[in-house]
Structures are given as structure tokens and as C-alpha cells.
Amino acid sequence: APVPPGEDSKDVAAPHRQPLTSSERIDKQIRYILDGISALRKETCNKSNMCESSKEALAENNLNLPKMAEKDGCFQSGFNEETCLVKIITGLLEFEVYLEYLQNRFESSEEQARAVQMSTKVLIQFLQKKAKNLDAITTPDPTTNASLLTKLQAQNQWLQDMTTHLILRSFKEFLQSSLRALRQM
């Protein structure tokens, strides 16, 4: 697994550097998770032809993956820092069940999948410290998540491969949209 943020050689080589600010820490954490997703996508794309498949709509119907929309306050038009932050945290919490699903989906990158999951939990904690309106954040229902997980795991092999591909693609996009918005804050 890659070295967690704050432990790379750049930091070691620059002892005079100021401690990371909250924003820098969040930025670094997202970039670390994106690295992990990139590695997982490599294995997925090498293993199957899902990355070139045009049948994504079939599997997408089963999934309710978080996505940024203009109403979420993260886009430049109608940008709202607090609304956007709530959307980012809520979205990450919703992704957690899908990241749990990914845990048994990789052979050579099993450690990487775990790192992505754990790093996302840490990112959520960082962001919760930044948010003022924690009451507006809705936590997914554990029972609903458990039945969703069971349903996803019961799919045939092709659908499971497609689901894995779609989760990684959507999570990457959500993180990139979050990264963009957070840098505007």
C-alpha cells in the first residue's frame, strides 16, 4: 500500500516546513485516496474488459452512487461552502457501503482496497471537523446498507465486475469534484 499522507519523502526532506493546515491535510488525503483508486482501477481494467464496456447502464440501474449536482452548492454557479461541505460528507458516508463491497473484489490489490476504505474514514473525520452544520448530515441506515451489500454480493460474476468498475469510476469522479470545491473554499 502507498505511504499515508504526511509520511512521504518530501516531508522528511523539508523539516523546516510548517505543519499542514486543515485544508492541506484534506487535500493530501483526497490525493492519496485517488492514488489508491487508480491502482484498483488498473487491476479491474486488466482483469476484465469492463473499462471499455458500453453496457454500464444495465448495472447502473442497481446502484445509487452519490454524484455532484448543481443544487449541491459545490459548482461555481450557486457555490455555497456549507451546503457543499454537507454534500461531500454525506456522499462519502454513502460511498462507505460500496467501499465495503470492494473489500473482497481484489486479489493482488487487497491491501490497496483496505487502504482506500480506511483513508476515506479518516477523510470523513477531517471534513466533519471543518463542517459547522453537522446536524444537516444524514448518516445512511445500517440495515439498508447491510441488505444492499447482500444484494450486490449475490449478483452474477459479470454484474459484480461491472459494479466494481462503476463504484471506482464514480468514487473517483466524486472525489475530484470534492477536491475542486474544497480548493475554492
Epitope: E24, L34, M68
Partner: antibody, heavy 119, light 106 residues
Amino acid sequence: QVTLKESGPTLVKPTQTLTLTCSFSGFSLSTSGVGVGWVRQPPGKALEWLAFIFWDDDKYYSPSLESRLTITKDTSKNQVVLTMTNMDPVDTATYYCARSADDYLYYSFDYWGQGTLVT
Amino acid sequence: DIQMTQSPSSLSAFVGDGVTMTCWASQSINDYLNWYHQRPGEAPELLVFAASNLQIGVPSRFRGSGSETYFTLTINSLQPEDSGTYFCQNGHSFPLTFGGGTKLEI
């Protein structure tokens, strides 16, 4: 192979609207992390960023020109269009479109069009 | 807006020499700093992204460094084709801003 090409009028009268089209190939503007921006350069001067559009249709504009600029994309045609209203002689410049594409959104322009001089 | 300031505005050197130019950001931009080279009559070309990463195809005599507000671009063993203007760019947040440029004469 990534290519971008700007097209539009070379001569515009004061108060008129300038419409520039950036036609590109070799990448898709529906891929996450991808964006296309417009940058201009008056003769003998520095580069000035104008506008940027992302894969998900999020749009950003230069604050000093925001009221005059509109950027749109047509993903199926592989085109990005910039319109600039109320043109003035000080807007004389070479206008470039450029691509940005990386996982971390460094907003670095790795491919540029040849530029089009608008007077 | 984040202001980008480049220094010097111009410099001249001989083939084989080494030069360093600097770029300051008015506030911290982490490592979100890009460098471009532009020859007269041509479009800019990306040299370095994320402060220190060389773009594919760029010779290793180019080296970018720095973080937060202070960045440098060093060119070792100058070649005639290195002449032109070098621009730094804030890639952290919008509005994207460019420095005024450093004109290098070989």
C-alpha cells in the same frame, strides 16, 4: 493523439460579440478530471486566463471579464465555445484553447491549440 | 485572487550555462504550480506541473522546485532552443493566474 484548434473571426468591430470555437480530438470531455480552458495573450504581453469548463459542466470565469464571457461544451461534437460580448480594441489578442487532464486537477494545460489572432 | 510574481523579468545567458528563475504566489498554493515555455509566435508548452513534475518529453536539464508560496525553475546546460519566455501559473484554485513571465535570451 490530442489536438485542439481554435476557429472564429479574425476581425471584430467594437461592441460586437466574439464567438470562438475550440474543436478537439484525442480525448473526451466526459471523462472525469478533464477540462478545457481559454487563455489569451495581447501582442507582446503575458498570458491571461479567461474561462474553464469541466467534464461535469462546472464553469469558471475570470472575475474581471465574467459579465462578458460564456463558455459551453458540446461533448458529442468535441467542441467548446467561448463567447465574449461588447468587444473593445483592448481585447485584441491571440486566443488559445487548451486541455487540462489529470487525476489531481492541477489545472495544468498539457495541450494547446495553435491560437487565433483576433483584432 | 492569487497573484503570481516572476523574477527576473528578463535575463541572458550563454549556451551551456545554468539559470534559475523564481515565482511567488500571494498566498499558499501547496504544490499546485505549473511552468510553461513559449517561443515567439508559438503556443505555450507545459514544462513542469505540480511544482516539480516534468511533463513527458521535457529534457531532464529542466527542474522545478518549491511549495506553498515560493517556486523556482532551474535550467542546466542551456541550449539555443531554450530561449523564449517562461510563465508560471497558479493551478490551485480559480481564477487561474499567470505570472508576468521571464524572458530568456541565449
